[in-house]
């Protein structure tokens, strides 16, 4: 019986050009994690494997950094990065647990920054 639960950062937003950490945590199970896949829609971004460590997909190498922990850091965000991201925990003996994160990348503008820090 699969008793585990995945906690994620949920729905998050970040500004274009910035970076964001995608984080999932598997809890409430003593199943051992053997690998964690990070996927965007049907594309594999990265995998952290028990015996091989981290592997970042070649097409994302410049913008994806492993960690912290089993999380993933996305850098130099573009509006096209908006969408669903999935952390897939492969465990023994439970099987597979999947967590979902929705990332919205927002356009940033000088005007917005100016207004935000304006002194009255």
């Amino acid at each position: 019986m699969m008793t585990g639960t995945i906690e994620t950062t949920g729905n998050i937003s970040a500004e274009k050009g910035g970076s964001i950490i995608l984080q999932c945590h598997l809890s409430s199970t003593t199943a051992q994690v053997t690998a964690v896949n990070w996927e965007q829609q049907d594309q594999l971004l990265a995998i952290c494997n028990a015996d091989l460590g981290w592997h970042i997909s070649p097409s994302f190498k410049d913008r994806v950094a492993p960690g912290p922990g089993l999380g993933l850091t996305l850098q130099s965000l573009t509006v096209n990065d908006t969408g669903e991201y999935f952390c897939i925990y492969h465990t023994y003996p439970d099987g597979t647990y999947t967590g979902r994160i929705f990332l919205e990348v927002l356009e940033s503008s000088v005007a917005e920054h100016g207004a935000r820090f304006q002194i009255p």
Epitope: E7, H25, L26, S27, T30, Q32, V33, T34, A35, V36, C48, N49, A50, D51, G67, P68, G69, L70, H90, Y92, P93
Partner: antibody, heavy 119, light 113 residues
Framework: EVQLVESGGGLVKPGGSLKLSCAAS????????MSWVRQTPEKRLEWVAY????????YYPDTVKGRFTISRDNAKNTLYLQMSSLKSEDTAIYYC????????????WGQGTTLTVSS | DIVMSQSPSSLAVSVGEKVTMTCKSS????????????LAWYQQKPGQSPKLLIY???TRESGVPDRFTGSGSGTDFTLTISSVKAEDLAVYYC?????????FGGGTKLEIK
Amino acid sequence: EVQLVESGGGLVKPGGSLKLSCAASGFAFSDYDMSWVRQTPEKRLEWVAYISDGGYNTYYPDTVKGRFTISRDNAKNTLYLQMSSLKSEDTAIYYCARQILLRYYFDYWGQGTTLTVSS
Amino acid sequence: DIVMSQSPSSLAVSVGEKVTMTCKSSQSLLYSSNQKNYLAWYQQKPGQSPKLLIYWASTRESGVPDRFTGSGSGTDFTLTISSVKAEDLAVYYCQQYHSYPWTFGGGTKLEIK
């Protein structure tokens, strides 16, 4: 150089409590899972507690569950083991040990701190 | 719980001899999805803490001399020291990290004649 230095051991009466500490240096502490492993007077090794890199997961064997609590302070690079309702069979050398993410063997061990539970 | 049994409990050999010690688990330590055996070997010299020698049953830890070799799969594992040195005087433990709770064998004490 990886260093793990345990402290806090001593003589405790049955039913008593004690908190052990492990100061880590020479590596990025928050990137590693950690465990406490003890060695009994008969030289047997027993794993007693595990905590994940960020502290969100903890596991214990049935022998100590409900009596021992593992925790960590990543800002201070320190691992802790709070022990309560101590029994004579908890007498041992307690080691803190490092684990690489997703690999559950112990790649570095501290020098150990001794707990004696006796009246 | 997975029970780990080591044999012999002790042995005495002369410098230069080959040594073999065994470790048996009560259930398979082979994980089918990655074909890895979740078994480690440790060396504990007198007055010291344990030191990792071998993981994944056969992968030597960095800095460990190549006279130490781990082998085996499933439930039967072996640690071999091809040519014993005086500094190998120690107790050797196997550990399974296949499933909770992680468990150790009782150890094999290597003595030098």
